[in-house]
């Protein structure tokens, strides 16, 4: 090994990665909100819809104060990977009624993938556990009917909206601890 030499700074550092994750999450939240509104316009929802395969909401307003960086990032990554799988499934199996929303769903999927990559990079730079906790992956079968796929889309977009909402709050809070 030669004499010590400095390395130039790379494009970002963990705090910049966290800033970027917040921006990406906010932008994804806006996209999701807009797409959910489009869904309600085209296919009015009769009450709240749920899907057993979706992750349960990780946080409530009351638990925000006790958040720890590793737990938040791991849980957010696991939940977003589940939502990504559901969006992919919607695009594949949603049927003709959802084909009109294909460009928006495609853009949503691309943004989700980008956010997941940013979270992974952040976890890598912080040397936090990368492995997602083992969770049973519920196989996603084809929707029972056209109405079934519409209800699933309402549930997926609604759940993703709530998840991203707590994610923005959580990530902003964690910024102060890094």
């Amino acid at each position: 090994p030669g004499p010590p030499a400095g390395s130039p700074r790379v494009s970002s550092d963990p705090r910049a990665d966290l800033d970027s994750a917040v921006l990406l999450t906010r932008s994804l939240l806006a996209d999701t909100r807009q797409l959910a509104a489009q869904m309600r316009d085209k296919f009015p929802a009769d009450g709240d819809h749920s899907l057993d395969s979706l992750p349960t909401l990780a946080m409530s307003a009351g638990t925000l104060g006790s958040l720890q960086l590793p737990g938040v990032l791991t849980r957010l990554r696991v939940d977003l990977m589940s939502y990504l799988r559901h969006v992919q499934w919607l695009r594949r199996a949603g049927g003709p009624s959802l084909k009109t929303l294909e460009p928006e769903l495609g853009a949503l999927q691309a943004r989700l993938e980008r956010l997941l990559r940013r979270l992974q990079l952040l976890m890598s730079r912080l040397a936090l556990p990368q492995a997602a906790p083992d969770q049973p992956v519920i196989p996603l079968g084809p929707p029972a009917s056209a109405w079934g796929s519409i209800r699933a889309a309402h549930a997926i977009l609604g759940g993703l909206h709530l998840t991203l909402d707590w994610a923005v709050r959580g990530l902003l809070l964690l910024k102060t601890r890094l």
């Epitope: 400095g6 390395s7 700074r9 790379v10 550092d13 963990p14 705090r15 590793p70 990977m81 997941l116 990559r117 992974q120 990079l121 890598s124 730079r125 912080l126 040397a127 936090l128 556990p129 990368q130 492995a131 890094l178």
Partner: antibody, heavy 114, light 111 residues
């Protein structure tokens, strides 16, 4: 400019111990996970150990588990590797690295030989 | 034997485009983990070349690019130059080892 400066390498007999240090400057040390990666003469890179930004998570390659201990002192911007029960196959240049790793030191040579 | 498999050597003439592959498994690249690439010039420490599959750190020329698909990744170098002669390593997190793993390295020769 980012600098990582390793020290503490040298010649040691099999079964002996060494403590490597890595002094960091030019970046926010406490915001980065840190790694030790080694390279035996003429061979490829082998990850050895890592520690999270705050020291709460530590990881080890199977080949060093139970013999090496990684630690850090964020107040001193320094990373450490305590190496015990050293073997001939531990002979290598040991690099300290930060982040992905994004930044690497120049390395310190550890020779285990009788 | 490395967890990530790379060809031991690759070569090309100045101006050419060369590609170096990195093949993993379902516990690393196939599990969705990002791939990073390092360049090690003779007698020096490794340097980050590509991170997160295809992102370049500042200062790395756009002749270097990365991609990932399924359980493998690749590094492409276009407009090959004599100063690109070096060892190239891929790396990714591995679930079964609970840590990052490196490929065995590819020695690139510019003819």
């Amino acid at each position: 400019e980012v600098q990582l400066l390793e020290s503490g390498g040298g010649l040691v007999q099999p079964g002996g111990s060494l403590r490597l240090s890595c002094a960091a400057s030019g970046f926010t040390f406490s915001s980065y996970g840190m790694h030790w990666v080694r390279q035996a003469p003429g061979k490829g890179l082998e990850w050895v150990s890592a520690i999270s930004y705050d020291g709460s998570y530590k990881y080890y390659a199977d080949s060093v588990k139970g013999r090496f201990t990684i630690s850090r002192d964020n107040s001193k911007n320094t990373l450490y590797l305590q190496m015990n029960s050293l073997r001939a196959e531990d002979t290598a240049v040991y690099y300290c690295a930060a982040g992905v790793p994004d930044y690497w030191g120049q390395g310190t040579l550890v020779t285990v030989s009788s | 034997q490395s967890v990530l498999t790379q060809p031991p050597s690759a070569s090309g003439t100045p101006g050419q485009r060369v590609t170096i592959s990195c093949t993993g498994s379902s516990s690393n690249i196939g599990a969705g983990y990002d791939v990073h690439w390092y360049q090690q010039l003779p007698g020096t420490a490794p340097k980050l070349l590509i991170y997160s599959n295809n992102e370049r750190p500042s200062g790395v020329p756009d002749r270097f690019s990365g991609s990932k698909s399924g359980t493998s990744a690749s590094l492409a170098i276009s407009g090959l130059r004599s100063e690109d002669e070096a060892d190239y390593y891929c790396a990714a997190w591995d679930d079964s080892l609970n840590g990052p793993v490196f490929g065995g390295g590819t020695k690139l020769t510019v003819l």
